[in-house]
């Protein structure tokens, strides 16, 4: 019988008492084969973290700073359940740390030196740790003691709880630096008042502070937020302009064998029986003998943290950067305006080899990082382990939902002004063998399908979106008799046709021979009835253009396109017979890397782009013998996006809507994780 006990860690006598009450009340409402609670008492949260890591306890609820400690080796804990606040309909699991300024003050984030600052309190998250952590490398040296460096950075501050004797500048705007509400500038409202009264130029608070203190929109309009990209936004645009997004209070568990499903089962049942307004005799979110015992008193319930979410992703790049800076205190030798090398994310061995070749030829401008799947690469870019990669539109959508931005677009048509003219897109098509003359768009049920990969534009999002509109369910593996859609569940019929060996079967990378455009077409040639690819795929792999044994004798005339009206047309008539227009592949990065990725890639394409005439004697960035490694092989240049610099603007309303509709069929664990952070 599996042990269904969750050992909860308590950090005080009062918590231990509440834990025992929790245990006893759960016993009375949950059947004997359900989850149960046991209580483990430790002296501190850090002791609880160590106990969970050592398998002496299973769970504890932590604030963000401690979630970071819990994640660090050797603890390796992960977030599993989040407390939410507000309503069930609009649950808030995060708050945003923001920098508020007056509208007419005219400076940006990178011009804070010499300004007057208002803080909620020394050592507090939104008011101190996050802003000072993010500004850390701009502080004058020596940076220790930190208070002295901060005092020398700003021209005056109010940082309640600071030592006014040793660091008088930190108390200049609020004499005495009192550490309670007796100090009018203490806490969130106090720091905002410090700004409002004109004592300070910037207040470091949380996003709700301004709404709680100014009910009137006209009054709020006198203020703006400073964004990390050195722009400003209105105060209600905090989701797009903040210093960090911070989880409020989170249950953590071991990453391996951490009982996360059991913990969720326990807490979900607990909130049903003892949540807000549920029971008089025991309340989960109430602490008669103290404050915030086990859980925050202000919590309204729990949400399961998606399993793909590790602590780094959960805390977010900005928060992790701020806390790491404060804890480790390391900065680059001298902050220069020069760009650091761009860390390119490469999928599997084939891409890594090409990336390494690029890295050597780039003379230090490009470095390479490996991952097994596109989603793993996106996650690495999010957390700073990598910086950039080029993605199909379907993954540009996921990357965008995860906070990344498009920076350059692949262009596929030769033109005089390639780099300045991003194209409208390419065509997603359905290809069949000419010999299968009875096959049409309307009778694909039961046929064998070949897809570039799950989640990609031409190979999945467009054809499956159209199919979904017709069949109104997500069971595509039942619609086709079998197929190869790399990235599907391994036991799915949509992995049956794939050719990868062993663990590589159906993997969404080049280790699966039927992956990508060329792979999907090969799948059609060798096994399938229909391939969902781009309009250039057939000509690029026929007429001897692809020397591989499976392709060298193929003829374009032996293939036809399926049109949505039920007719068929020759391959060259793609403009009048396609499934939809697809946005070109695009390079994505984090917002903080946007300028450097743009600059370095434009230099790189001038050195190794399609202006290189002899690829046998020189490195060519956009060539890889039809394997589309790092970039599509038919890329002519990487083009500026002009104002299409968000994923929505880049992909266009129609495509975003189409992918949004298909979201209910999504198997993307990363998309689920990212929409948890930003619904």
């Amino acid at each position: 019988v599996p042990d269904k006990t969750v050992r909860w860690c308590a950090v005080s006598e009062h918590e231990a008492t509440k834990c025992q009450s929790f245990r006893d009340h759960m016993k009375s409402v949950i059947p004997s084969d359900g989850p149960s609670v046991a209580c483990v008492k430790k002296a501190s949260y850090l002791d609880c973290i160590r106990a969970i890591a050592a398998n002496e306890a299973d769970a504890v609820t932590l604030d963000a700073g401690l979630v970071y400690d819990a994640y660090l080796a050797p603890n390796n804990l992960k977030p599993v359940v989040a407390e939410f606040y507000g309503s069930k309909e609009d649950p808030q699991t995060f708050y945003y740390a923001v920098a508020v300024v007056k509208k007419d003050s005219g400076f940006q984030m990178n011009q804070l030196r010499g300004k007057k600052s208002c803080h909620t309190g020394l050592g507090r998250s939104a008011g101190w740790n996050i802003p000072i952590g993010l500004l850390y490398c701009d502080l004058p040296e020596p940076r220790k003691p930190l208070e002295k460096a901060v005092a020398n950075f700003f021209s005056g501050s109010c940082a309640p709880c600071a030592d006014g004797t040793d660091f008088p500048q930190l108390c200049q705007l609020c004499p005495g630096c009192g550490c309670s509400t007796l100090n009018q500038y203490f806490g969130y409202s106090g720091a905002f008042k410090c700004l409002k009264d004109g004592a300070g130029d910037v207040a470091f608070v949380k996003h709700s502070t301004i709404f709680e203190n100014l009910a009137n929109k006209a009054d709020r309009d006198q203020y703006e937020l400073l964004c990390l990209d050195n722009t400003r936004k209105p105060v209600d645009e905090y989701k797009d302009c903040h210093l960090a997004q911070v989880p409020s209070h989170t249950v953590v568990a071991r990453s391996m064998g951490g009982k996360e499903d059991l913990i969720w089962e326990l807490l979900n049942q607990a909130q049903e029986h003892f949540g807000k307004d549920k029971s008089k005799e025991f309340q989960l979110f109430s602490s008669p003998h103290g404050k915030d015992l086990l859980f925050k008193d202000s919590a309204h319930g729990f949400l399961k943290v998606p399993p793909r979410m590790d602590a780094k992703m959960y805390l977010g790049y900005e928060y992790v950067t701020a806390i790491r800076n404060l804890r480790e205190g390391t900065c680059p030798e001298a902050p220069t305006d020069e760009c650091k090398p761009v860390k390119w994310c490469a999928l599997s061995h084939h891409e890594r080899l090409k990336c390494d070749e690029w890295s050597v030829n780039s003379v230090g401008k490009i470095e390479c990082v490996s991952a097994e799947t596109t989603e793993d690469c996106i996650a690495k870019i999010m957390n700073g382990e990598a910086d950039a990669m080029s993605l199909d539109g379907g993954f540009v959508y996921i990357a965008g939902k995860c906070g990344l931005v498009p920076v350059l677009a692949e262009n596929y048509n030769k033109s005089d002004n390639c780099e300045d003219t991003p194209e409208a897109g390419y065509f997603a098509i359905a290809v069949v063998k000419k010999s299968a003359s009875d096959l049409t768009w309307d009778n694909l049920k039961g046929k064998k399908s070949c897809h570039t990969a799950v989640g990609r534009t031409a190979g999945w999002n467009i054809p499956m979106g159209l199919l979904y509109n017709k069949i109104n369910h997500c069971r595509f593996d039942e619609f086709f008799s079998e197929g190869c859609a790399p990235g599907s569940k391994k036991d799915s019929s949509l992995c049956k046709l794939c050719m990868g060996s062993g663990l590589n079967l159906c993997e969404p990378n080049n280790k699966e021979g039927y992956y990508g455009y060329t792979g999907a077409f090969r799948c059609l040639v060798e096994k399938g009835d229909v391939a969902f690819v781009k309009h250039q795929t057939v000509p690029q792999n026929t007429g001897g253009k692809n020397p591989d044994p499976w392709a060298k004798n193929l003829n374009e005339k032996d293939y036809e396109l399926l049109c949505l009206d039920g007719t068929r047309k020759p391959v060259e008539e793609y403009a009048n017979c396609h499934l939809a227009r697809a946005p070109n592949h695009a390079v994505v990065t984090r917002k903080d890397k946007e300028a450097c990725v743009h600059k370095i890639l434009r230099q790189q394409q001038h050195l190794f782009g399609s202006n290189v005439t002899d690829c046998s004697g020189n490195f060519c960035l956009f060539r890889s013998e039809t394997k589309d490694l790092l970039f599509r092989d038919d890329t002519v240049c990487l083009a500026k996006l002009h104002d299409r610099n968000t994923y929505e603007k880049y992909l266009g309303e129609e495509y975003v809507k189409a992918v949004g509709n298909l979201r209910k069929c999504s198997t993307s664990s990363l998309l689920e994780a990212c929409t948890f952070r930003r619904p």
Partner: nanobody, 112 residues
Framework: QVKLEESGGGLVQAGGSLRLSCVAS????????VIWYRQAPGKQRELVAL???????NYRESVKGRFTISRDDAKNTVWLQMNALEPEDTGVYYC??????FGQGTQVTVSS
């Protein structure tokens, strides 16, 4: 001006071994890394192995476990140790570093 010279090629039976060397004249050799390529008759030139200045190495899939690339910066030399050679390994082997043109290469022939 740095020049590269490859040597160590020859005719060998399948299963045999060869050690190729790439020697540079001039300074600043391989600061950014060195790549061994090969070209078989009528085929595209392909990357075989590379070594970066920090000692990081990578190989094309078909030679992994059989070939080893190494360097000695004091001797301005990069080696390619080739074991368990196969007929498919036949071709002219070249070494390359950024900004330096290809040398003459060294012919490797593996007979079955």
């Amino acid at each position: 001006q740095v020049k590269l010279e490859e040597s160590g090629g020859g005719l060998v039976q399948a299963g045999g071994s060869l050690r190729l060397s790439c020697v540079a004249s001039g300074s600043g050799f391989g600061v950014n890394g060195v790549i061994w390529y090969r070209q078989a008759p009528g085929k595209q030139r392909e990357l075989v192995a590379l070594i970066k200045s920090d000692g990081y190495t990578n190989y094309r899939e078909s030679v992994k476990g059989r070939f080893t690339i190494s360097r000695d910066d004091a001797k301005n030399t990069v080696w390619l140790q080739m074991n368990a050679l196969e007929p498919e390994d036949t071709g002219v082997y070249y070494c390359k570093t950024p900004g330096v043109p290809f040398g003459q290469g060294t012919q490797v022939t593996v007979s079955s």
